[in-house]
């Protein structure tokens, strides 16, 4: 993870900091995972494309009573503080496949690392 800093542009690039912190939190979750994350709760998988932060929030918010991911839920809210319009929500909720929270977090982490490397901070 320390390598991620090398991809940051010189000078302050505001959104990159938030993205890096979200990545660090997801790394923390995956590294500290002992028992099944959130007791093996299942969540809807998402398309890791436009609207990804809102979609990830919408999926993970349905996991309750799992303190391990509450910080992640709140950090995702930082990227998606206001609800997207009703029309946009239809594309966020392609509810056909459920996966374990642990796998969801790993998939999201891999994608966010890729975005960070490519400098796509939004």
């Amino acid at each position: 993870l320390t390598c991620l800093g090398g991809f940051a542009s010189p000078g302050p690039v505001p959104p990159s900091t938030a993205l890096r912190e979200l990545i660090e939190e997801l790394v923390n979750i995956t590294q500290n995972q002992k028992a099944p994350l959130c007791n093996g709760s299942m969540v809807w998988s998402i398309n890791l494309t436009a609207g990804m932060y809102c979609a990830a929030l919408e999926s993970l918010i349905n996991v309750s009573g799992c303190s391990a991911i509450e910080k992640t839920q709140r950090m995702l809210s930082g990227f998606c503080p206001h609800k997207v319009s009703a029309g946009q929500f239809s594309s966020l909720h392609v509810r056909d496949t459920k996966i374990e929270v642990a796998q969801f977090v790993k998939d999201l982490l891999l994608h966010l690392k890729k975005l960070f490397r490519e400098g796509q901070f939004n």
């Epitope: 959104p15 938030a18 950090m75 995702l76 930082g78 503080p81 609800k83 909720h93």
Partner: antibody, heavy 118, light 111 residues
Framework: EVQLVESGGGLVQPGGSLRLSCAAS????????MSWVRQAPGKGLEWVAS???????YYPDSVKGRFTISRDNAKNSLYLQMNSLRAEDTAVYYC????????????WGQGTLVTVSS | DIQMTQSPSSLSASVGDRVTITCKAS??????????VHWYQQKPGKAPKLLIY???NLESGVPSRFSGSGSGTDFTLTISSLQPEDFATYYC?????????FGGGTKVEIK
Amino acid sequence: EVQLVESGGGLVQPGGSLRLSCAASGFTFSSYAMSWVRQAPGKGLEWVASISSGDTTYYPDSVKGRFTISRDNAKNSLYLQMNSLRAEDTAVYYCARNEGYYFGLTLWGQGTLVTVSS
Amino acid sequence: DIQMTQSPSSLSASVGDRVTITCKASESVDHFGWSLVHWYQQKPGKAPKLLIYRASNLESGVPSRFSGSGSGTDFTLTISSLQPEDFATYYCQQSNEDPWTFGGGTKVEIK
């Protein structure tokens, strides 16, 4: 200490401009969305603007095109540039940490008074 | 815009009383099973403070005598046993639709 401190309020004439600032401390400012909420004297609360951690901005119609919210993560600071001010913009302006539509406005500053009057 | 109507606008109560404040939205503020309503407390000359998020979730550090309930358009904030520090104005807020809107407030005064 986790806190938000607003500054920049004051008396301004109708049609004038003012820039409010909010200094954040005690938390990782860059990870949070932030908002401005105002309260006219003796009245209720009104949401004014929000900015996400990815710099997306949101405004109600009442201030759209006149107010601009921005942030400087390097300085842990939030700003509200207010142009074309009207008498009805007179209020205490609060800076608030916005944890999104699922979690609400979780931390507020003490506010700064803006008076628009000739 | 979604209108949030609180009642009563003010009430007088004594320490130890059970107090109930209601908030009615002009349309449903439910979203995929969650009620996007939050409650705040504001004391004179002070900033608001979040008490309850998502209709019924107690914010960290808030005393358990505060509770929230409701769904759809009708919501309630309850203080089970009013304490001296609870005399304040309470606001509900919806975040289901932009613009976010607040209720007009309920002032809880000492009887």
